[in-house]
């Protein structure tokens, strides 16, 4: 389970994203971002410093629209 406001790295980060985002899937950098994919992403925000559940959820993919 997710413990708020702590650093999440490596496998823990991936596992937590899978738990939080579920079937939606997730990104390591927000798709809307125009900056380099490595410049600022979830690794920097959650592993290099601590992050919370709200921030984690911003990296979840948008669910596909059903026809």
């Amino acid at each position: 389970a997710y413990r708020p406001s702590e650093t999440l790295c490596g496998g823990e980060l991936v596992d937590t994203l899978q738990f939080v985002c579920g079937d939606r899937g997730f990104y390591f950098s927000r798709p809307a971002s125009r900056v380099s994919r490595r410049s600022r992403g979830i690794v920097e925000e959650c592993c290099f410093r601590s992050c919370d559940l709200a921030l984690l959820e911003t990296y979840c993919a948008t669910p596909a629209k059903s026809e």
């Epitope: 496998g11 823990e12 380099s36 410049s39 592993c47």
Partner: antibody, heavy 121, light 107 residues
Framework: QVQLVESGAEVKKPGASVKVSCKAS????????MHWVRQAPGQGLEWMGI????????SYAQKFQGRVTMTRDTSTSTVYMELSSLRSEDTAVYYC??????????????WGQGTLVTVSS | DIQMTQSPSSVSASVGDRVTITCRAS??????LVWYQQKPGKAPKLLIY???RLQSGVPSRFSGSGSGTLFTLIINNLQPEDFATYYC?????????FGGGTKVEIK
């Protein structure tokens, strides 16, 4: 092909600092995280920290916090690791290692040749 | 920090043998385990990541398995170039930590 070339061996006195460089080639420097790992003579491997060559942000192992500084120069595709307040226990081979994963998983697919740092009075 | 314990610390084997190396984590790490091979005076080489995924270019005689706290590296049909030291490493959380190594020696 991917190559990580480190600077040469160093001999330092206790209390001094050392700065080791690692020049990358054969790939897009800013697209892969870089780690530093050390190995004392005849001993195992010890992770020191990670740097994002794109933004320059870093994360260090608690053990080295306050003594280690990792930086990068994108113009020369080089990362640096500086260790201060050296003691005899810091005698080791220092490796830079590239992370193969976008999630900074610590999967080191390419390594530098290693830099031997000897700390002796 | 997660402690990684390898066994045995050394093993003597002959060319053609099957060698099994075990790695235990002090807490569950799912499948976030890596195996490296290191020869004297050289940098380590990535063999297996995510417990069982073979790194590109690594011979198929190497295989990894396990999850949770217990992991295994198997070398089938041991070749002369396989005599080396093998390290496991957890990639579940920082600090990343390594096992103490297993030296595979010629019998």
């Amino acid at each position: 092909q991917v190559q990580l070339v480190e600077s040469g061996a160093e001999v330092k006195k206790p209390g001094a600092s050392v700065k080791v460089s690692c020049k990358a080639s054969g790939y897009t420097f800013t697209s892969y995280y870089m780690h530093w790992v050390r190995q004392a003579p005849g001993q195992g491997l010890e992770w020191m920290g990670i740097i994002n060559p794109s933004g320059g942000s870093t994360s260090y192992a608690q053990k080295f916090q306050g003594r280690v500084t990792m930086t990068r120069d994108t113009s020369t595709s080089t990362v640096y690791m500086e260790l201060s307040s050296l003691r005899s226990e810091d005698t080791a081979v220092y490796y830079c290692a590239r992370d193969r994963s976008i999630a900074a998983m610590g999967w080191f697919d390419h390594w530098g040749q290693g830099t031997l740092v000897t700390v002796s009075s | 920090d997660i402690q990684m314990t390898q066994s045995p610390s050394s093993v003597s084997a002959s060319v053609g043998d099957r060698v099994t190396i075990t790695c235990r984590a002090s807490q569950g790490i799912s499948s976030w385990l890596v195996w490296y091979q290191q020869k004297p005076g050289k940098a380590p080489k990535l063999l297996i990541y995510a417990a069982s995924r073979l790194q590109s270019g690594v011979p198929s005689r190497f295989s990894g398995s396990g999850s949770g706290t217990l992991f295994t590296l198997i070398i089938n049909n041991l070749q002369p170039e396989d005599f080396a030291t093998y390290y496991c490493q957890q990639s579940n959380s920082v600090p990343l930590t390594f096992g103490g190594g297993t030296k595979v020696e010629i019998k």
